[in-house]
């Protein structure tokens, strides 16, 4: 009777677009059939996907966040079979160019400008922004209550990913029209 | 969670056929080992056909040459055509799925169907 398997990786937490992966389904055994699934399917037919030593052996190339999914192995011979646990692929991705909210650029003076900064990042980046070029606080929002037409002028949020060892960022133009004016958005 | 469902039995004379089919729902895996047992009044389950990953089948020996198990992976249906039924024969018959151990074990499947009587007369 064939026992439980289990797999085992080289790389547990691989990079997007830069590492591959070997998924390896223990233990090898005589006269056994290995086979894989991916979120309970078959596999997909993929150039980036290489079963080798006979096919006790998944190999995926330039991995992408799309493969953050749950593989299985599965062995099996003329009287028993058995299927491992699920291990799901860790994929380090990111950052992602960030998104500013809200979209609008023209506020009236003494509104709260509140802006939040987000980037698909694994894991989550950490957040800074600057205005005008200078440094800010190093948080995924910003806020300045009762904002005056000093406050015009760019504001860059900066995103980094320390596991993948990536940044990226965003500048948004705010400009702040005093009161009795009528910008093209008010907040 | 897997859902089984049985359909195909009934009442049949001996030398007749019936073709039973098991249908599989739920957190399912392609191409999954999906085996048919039956079990008489006053009787354990016995296994009675296996179909595995690669589609191999087993039987027990009483019903080879009788008896065949066949999966239609779109529908993710398995089947069990059974011909020249014997008096024998009558049981109710379950499917099963989610196996981790002998194909012919019971206790190695997880998830099972509430089963489909089949009678044979003489």
């Known amino acids: 009777e064939l026992p439980k398997p289990s797999i085992s990786s080289n790389n547990s937490k691989p990079v997007e677009d830069k590492d591959a992966v070997a998924f390896t389904c223990e233990p090898e055994a005589q006269n056994t059939t290995y086979l894989w699934w991916v979120n309970g399917q078959s596999l997909p037919v993929s150039p980036r996907l290489q079963l080798s030593n006979g096919n006790r052996t998944l190999t995926l190339f330039n991995v992408t966040r799309n493969d953050a999914r749950a593989y299985v192995c599965g062995i099996q011979n003329s009287v028993s079979a058995n299927r491992s646990d699920p291990v799901t692929l860790d994929v380090l991705y990111g950052p992602d160019t960030p998104i500013i909210s809200p979209p609008d650029s023209s506020y009236l003076s003494g509104a709260n400008l509140n802006l939040s900064c987000h980037s698909a990042s694994n894991p989550s980046p950490q957040y800074s922004w600057r205005i005008n070029g200078i440094p800010q606080q190093h948080t995924q929002v910003l806020f300045i209550a009762k904002i005056t037409p000093n406050n015009n002028g760019t504001y860059a949020c900066f995103v980094s990913n320390l596991a993948t060892g990536r940044n990226n960022s965003i500048v948004k133009s705010i400009t702040v029209s005093a009161s009795g004016t009528s910008p093209g958005l008010s907040a | 969670e897997v859902q089984l469902v049985e359909s195909g039995g009934g009442l049949v004379q001996a030398g007749g056929s019936l073709r039973l089919s098991c249908a599989a729902s739920?957190?399912?895996?392609?191409?999954?080992?999906m085996g048919w047992f039956r079990q008489a009044p006053g009787k354990e389950r016995e296994f009675v056909a296996v179909?595995?990953?690669?589609?191999?089948?087993y039987y027990l020996d009483s019903v080879k040459g009788r008896f065949t198990i066949s999966r239609e992976n779109a529908e993710n249906t398995v089947y069990l055509q059974m011909n020249s039924l014997k008096p024998e024969d009558t049981a109710i018959y379950y499917c099963?799925?989610?196996?981790?151990?002998?194909?012919?074990?019971?206790?190695?499947?997880?998830?099972w169907g509430q089963g489909t009587q089949v009678t044979v007369s003489s």
């Open positions: 739920g957190r399912t895996f392609s191409r999954d080992v």
């Open positions: 179909i595995n990953w690669t589609d191999s089948t």
């Open positions: 099963a799925t989610g196996i981790g151990g002998l194909y012919r074990r019971p206790s190695a499947y997880k998830y």
